[in-house]
């Protein structure tokens, strides 16, 4: 399979982990498919619940994925940016606050591009809860870890921020920051952070992030 | 820096094709992005007639879409424009253009600075 | 295809004036709507795109504000190297299209 979309399709629409392929090759990958969220299909390529895996880590890591799938984990950019240039993906990406709320921004069209081009995202047709404005720059930025600072400031902010994310200078998002728990949330330049949502000092509770055929 | 030129004949016939060509350089069509044919009508009116992506797929204004082919020849970083059946009413300013994304329609950040095209016998 | 309704057509301002080009769309673009700037004999140049990203090296006195239907640009201060068409367009869906143009005359 290629992605959850194509494992819901085989008939298997149980949530859980599943054996992946990369496009055009015979590598593997294992991720969590929601089989359930919005019709399902949907391959989860982030998640954030609970602090227990340690997301500041290497460009390599963000390469090629790290954490648990049924956990918080991180996909892997390369499998993702093959993936999503092989045909038109959506992106919804899944918020909690500490508060009870939810919210989501749901992007129609995905892609990430190659490692050569430093995985840059790119990003159109935004809508949903969390914001009239992306929280991701438009257009998008390249990829950024402690050991590879493509961002757009001075500053290092994969290292000021912490996690690899794709840092403008710094912007208004990083999913991959510090998790922190309820009641030290707050005025944290280091959190988890959806900027047109919550603001620039708010830390969320838990974040997905997913993406699926526009086809499907 | 990244630069487009246009290219081509500035005068066809009635029902002949137009061909031109958009030459790039400072950055690979194959590397990311989408390449676009963009024409201007006398009165400056702007219709968008389609693209190449940097992986070759082609997206193509439904209003031209039965005698419009956009191709491209990587060794040289050049993509073609070719119009067939073309009439007076495809007089225009002719524009090559490069798009902010690379999978569907975007704005567009890089412009060649155009050719004039005129149809007429 | 979606329709942009660009007003208005003609702007005669004087230099340091203020001005605003709205543009309204058939159905919603999201927030997927950029502005160029035409100056006599040369081809269009990106301003805005995402509807309020100002591109690299504008100056800040070009803004865009809008998402939906309703999309404004306004230049806080002209200038008389402003003189130009300015059209704004939509990539939500294909085919992208474009506005009609504004086109700023300078008093």
């Known amino acids: 399979f290629r992605d959850c979309a194509e494992v819901f399709k085989s008939g298997h629409t149980t949530n859980g982990i599943y054996t992946l392929t990369f496009p055009n090759s015979t590598e593997e990958i294992k991720a969590y498919c929601d089989m359930e969220a919005g019709g399902g299909g949907w391959t989860i390529i982030q998640r954030r619940e609970d602090g227990s895996v340690d997301f500041q880590r290497t460009w390599k890591e963000y390469k090629v994925g790290f954490g648990n799938p049924s956990g918080e984990y991180w996909l892997g950019n390369e499998f993702v940016s093959q993936l999503t240039n092989q045909q038109r993906y959506v992106l919804k990406i899944h918020l909690k606050d500490w508060e009870g709320n939810e919210a989501y921004s749901l992007y129609e069209h995905f892609y990430l591009s190659s490692e050569e081009l430093n995985y840059r995202i790119h990003l159109k047709g935004l809508t949903g809860t969390a914001g009239k404005i992306s929280s991701i720059s438009q257009p998008g930025n390249d990829f950024s870890t402690k050991d590879g600072d493509n961002d757009k400031c001075i500053c290092k902010c994969s290292q000021m921020l912490t996690g690899g994310w794709w840092f403008d200078a710094c912007g208004a998002s990083n999913l991959n920051g510090m998790y922190y728990p309820q009641r030290q949330n707050t005025n944290k330049f280091n959190g988890i952070k959806w900027y047109y949502w919550k603001g620039s000092g708010y830390s969320l509770k838990a974040t997905t992030m997913m993406i699926r055929p526009a086809d499907f | 820096d990244v630069q487009l030129q246009e290219s081509g004949p500035g005068l066809v016939k009635p029902s002949q094709s137009l061909s031109l060509t958009c030459t790039v350089t400072?950055?690979?069509?194959?590397?990311?992005?989408?390449w676009n044919w963009i024409r201007q009508f006398p009165g400056n009116k702007l219709e968008w007639m389609g693209y190449i992506s940097y992986s070759g797929s082609t997206s193509y204004n439904p209003s031209l879409k039965s005698r419009i082919s956009i191709t491209r020849d990587t060794s040289k970083n050049q993509f073609f424009l070719q119009l067939n059946s073309v009439t007076p009413e495809d007089t225009a300013t002719y524009y090559c253009?490069?798009?902010?994304?690379?999978?569907?329609?975007?704005?567009?950040?890089?412009w060649g600075q155009g050719t004039s095209v005129t149809v007429s016998s | 295809s979606i329709v942009m309704t660009q007003t208005p057509k003609l702007l005669l301002v004087s230099a340091g004036d203020r001005v605003t080009i709205t543009c309204k769309a058939s159905q919603s673009a999201s927030n997927d709507v950029a502005w160029y700037q035409q100056k006599p004999g040369q081809s269009p140049k990106l301003l805005i795109y995402?509807?309020?990203n100002r591109y690299t090296g504008v100056p800040d006195r070009f803004t865009g504000s809008g998402y939906g239907t309703d999309f404004t640009f306004a230049i806080s201060t002209v200038q008389a190297e402003d003189l130009a068409i300015y059209f704004c367009q939509q990539d939500y869906s294909s085919p992208p299209t474009f506005g009609g143009g504004t086109k700023l005359e300078i008093k």
């Open positions: 995402y509807a309020s």
């Open positions: 253009a490069r798009s902010t994304f690379g999978h569907y329609v975007s704005s567009m950040d890089y």
């Open positions: 400072g950055y690979s069509i194959t590397s990311d992005y989408a």
